[in-house]
């Protein structure tokens, strides 16, 4: 057979679908690998072929499109399961070819079981919403293309295992779920169950979104350095261990990169000859505000070390902050100048 452009296994597309539910999977070739769409390819005389490798097998085999009730079918560039079964799990390949051209890609498909409370190994998308913001809407995801616009499905929303009925600030509106002045107590997994008829059968689609209520942009601030501060003096004798925590509060800012670093006499720790250890820890509040602590330690401090200028720096998308630590040698009666 002719050479085929093999894009390998596209692990970026870890497709997960629920057992006993419809699934429509588009061939990734047209979405990520080729410059043209299916219609163009088809009109140019190219054919799309599907095959698969079962879980824990090496043998590629054709997909059986002659199952009862057309359980698996292909429509244009979409592979349909109506519905899935657990043993449909495997690596699926779509190949586009004619006598002179061939291109193919494989992708993993995992059929996942769920319990009556929608608990499963499924990875859910996370929707972040701002605390106390006016109205946030989430939309039941990934249901496009399952039924025609003429079909009006029934939609039921759940928080965890509980159907959302008379929730005070959460209102189901068909495919949408509206949150009014959200609070941290609105955090959780929200599931929509979409039920629609097709050829005399009822199908269910289950989709879950994890809601995380986060700090509002109106509360966003530049970094706030809690420690070091002007009230604490690190007074040490030569030979003792010097430990200075740099503790910084970052309010939640979407996609912000929060940084904390030390300078010693204006240089990064890696650029000085002092034997310094820096350990970092991070904790988060309920609204994903971040407290980042970098502990600078010198096991056996020298008189020279006690004359150095130790400055904690912090930066986020709102600004920068810096604060010098007050370090002095025990008993010599003077604090070194802390000019920045």
């Amino acid at each position: 057979s002719e050479r085929c452009d093999d894009w390998g296994l596209d692990t970026m597309r870890q497709i997960q679908v629920f057992e006993d539910e419809p699934a429509r999977i588009k061939c990734p070739l047209f979405e990520h690998f080729l410059k043209y769409n299916y219609s163009t390819a088809h009109s140019s005389g190219l054919t799309l072929i599907w095959y698969w490798t079962r879980q824990d097998r090496d043998l590629e085999e054709p997909i059986n499109f002659r199952l009862p009730e057309n359980r698996i079918s292909k429509e244009k560039d979409v592979l349909w399961f109506r519905p899935t079964l657990l043993n449909d799990t495997g690596n699926y390949t779509c190949m586009l070819r004619n006598t002179t051209y061939c291109s193919k890609v494989a992708f993993p498909l995992e059929v996942v079981q769920k319990d009556s409370c929608f608990n499963s190994a499924m990875r859910f998308p996370v929707h972040k919403m701002y605390i106390e913001h006016g109205i946030h809407k989430i939309t039941c995801p990934n249901v496009d293309g399952y039924f025609p616009s003429s079909v009006k499905p029934s939609v039921t929303w759940y928080k965890g295992c509980t159907e959302i009925v008379d929730f005070h600030n959460v209102l189901p509106e068909g495919m949408n779920l509206s949150f009014f002045i959200p609070l941290v107590s609105n955090n959780g997994n929200y599931t929509c169950v979409v039920t629609y008829p097709e050829n005399g059968r009822l199908f269910h689609l289950t989709r879950t979104v994890t809601v995380k209520v986060v700090g509002s942009p109106k509360d966003a601030l530049p970094p706030q350095i809690y420690s070091p501060n002007d009230r604490v003096v690190y007074e040490k004798e030569p030979g003792e261990e010097l430990v200075i925590p740099c503790k910084v509060y970052f309010s939640f800012i979407m996609d912000s990169h929060n940084e904390v670093w030390w300078t010693i006499d204006g240089k990064k720790p890696d650029d000085v000859t002092v034997d310094i250890t820096i350990n970092e820890s991070v904790s988060y509040s309920s609204t994903e505000d971040e407290t980042r602590t970098q502990i600078l330690s010198i096991k056996k401090v020298t008189p020279e070390d006690l004359r150095r200028n130790y400055v904690c720096h912090a930066r986020n998308t709102k600004g920068e902050a810096e604060q010098a630590a007050k370090v002095k040698q025990k008993g010599n009666g003077c604090t070194e100048p802390m000019t920045l």
Epitope: E132, H133, G134, I135, F180, I181, L183, V184, S216
Partner: antibody, heavy 118, light 107 residues
Framework: EVQLLESGGGLVQPGGSLRLSCAAS????????MGWVRQAPGKGLEWVSA????????LYADSVKGRFTISRDNSKNTLYLQMNSLRAEDTAVYYC???????????WGQGTLVTVSS | EIVMTQSPATLSVSPGERATLSCRAS??????LAWYQQKPGQAPRLLIY???TRATGIPARFSGSGSGTEFTLTISSLQSEDFAVYYC?????????FGQGTKVEIK
């Protein structure tokens, strides 16, 4: 200094309407969610309504839902409560209060008395 | 909705004594609980938020504790100006709800 000053209370007949106002000063009004809390004579406190800082989100106690409307004008630093179809059980002192998810109702107005009676 | 229950309804205490007020939530409110003081003819005043953080300007004799469903407001040494009605309020879930109040009176 944070100040909240309610006005618009008074005597009204059952079925009537009243509009309460709350003038805010001493803080950035548009940055805070606001609420109304009422207190019937000799009784405890009851949350009535809340509005988000941007004015888009509103919430109501079941006892007033469909009859009361909360709104705000951030350009005027003013909070409103439109009260329709008033009932005798709505008789209370109505307080406007600033709130924040960390610190609850941290500042209150002095209140305005609404009396619903024929 | 979350029901807040305060006890006792009335607490008789002598000036200088310690007063302990309780508040129970019908379900967990985490640490999202506030305490207010109200004197006759006045608006409520925030004392404690986050179950244990004193609001600005509140004397150190007022302290709050608890989380989840059980909360306590303690006034370590009652002053004459502390005789008032105290309300707890949860702000974890909508609708925000208040306890029915505890009246602290002079013994």
């Amino acid at each position: 200094e944070v100040q909240l000053l309610e006005s618009g209370g008074g005597l009204v007949q059952p079925g009537g309407s009243l509009r309460l106002s709350c003038a805010a000063s001493g803080f950035t009004f548009r940055d805070y969610a606001m609420g109304w809390v009422r207190q019937a004579p000799g009784k405890g406190l009851e949350w009535v309504s809340a509005i988000s800082y941007d004015g888009e989100g509103t919430l109501y106690a079941d006892s007033v839902k469909g009859r009361f409307t909360i709104s705000r004008d951030n350009s005027k630093n003013t909070l409103y409560l439109q009260m329709n179809s008033l009932r005798a059980e709505d008789t209370a002192v109505y307080y406007c209060a600033r709130f924040h998810y960390r610190s609850a109702f941290d500042y209150w107005g002095q209140g305005t008395l609404v009396t619903v009676s024929s | 909705e979350i029901v807040m229950t305060q006890s006792p309804a009335t607490l008789s205490v002598s000036p200088g004594e310690r007063a302990t007020l309780s508040c129970r939530a019908s379900q967990s409110v985490s640490s999202n609980l506030a305490w207010y003081q109200q004197k006759p003819g006045q608006a409520p005043r925030l004392l404690i938020y986050g179950a244990s953080t004193r609001a600005t300007g509140i004397p150190a004799r007022f302290s709050g504790s608890g989380s989840g469903t059980e909360f306590t407001l303690t006034i370590s040494s009652l002053q004459s100006e502390d005789f008032a009605v105290y309300y707890c309020q949860q702000y974890n879930n909508w609708p925000w709800t208040f306890g029915q109040g505890t009246k602290v009176e002079i013994k």
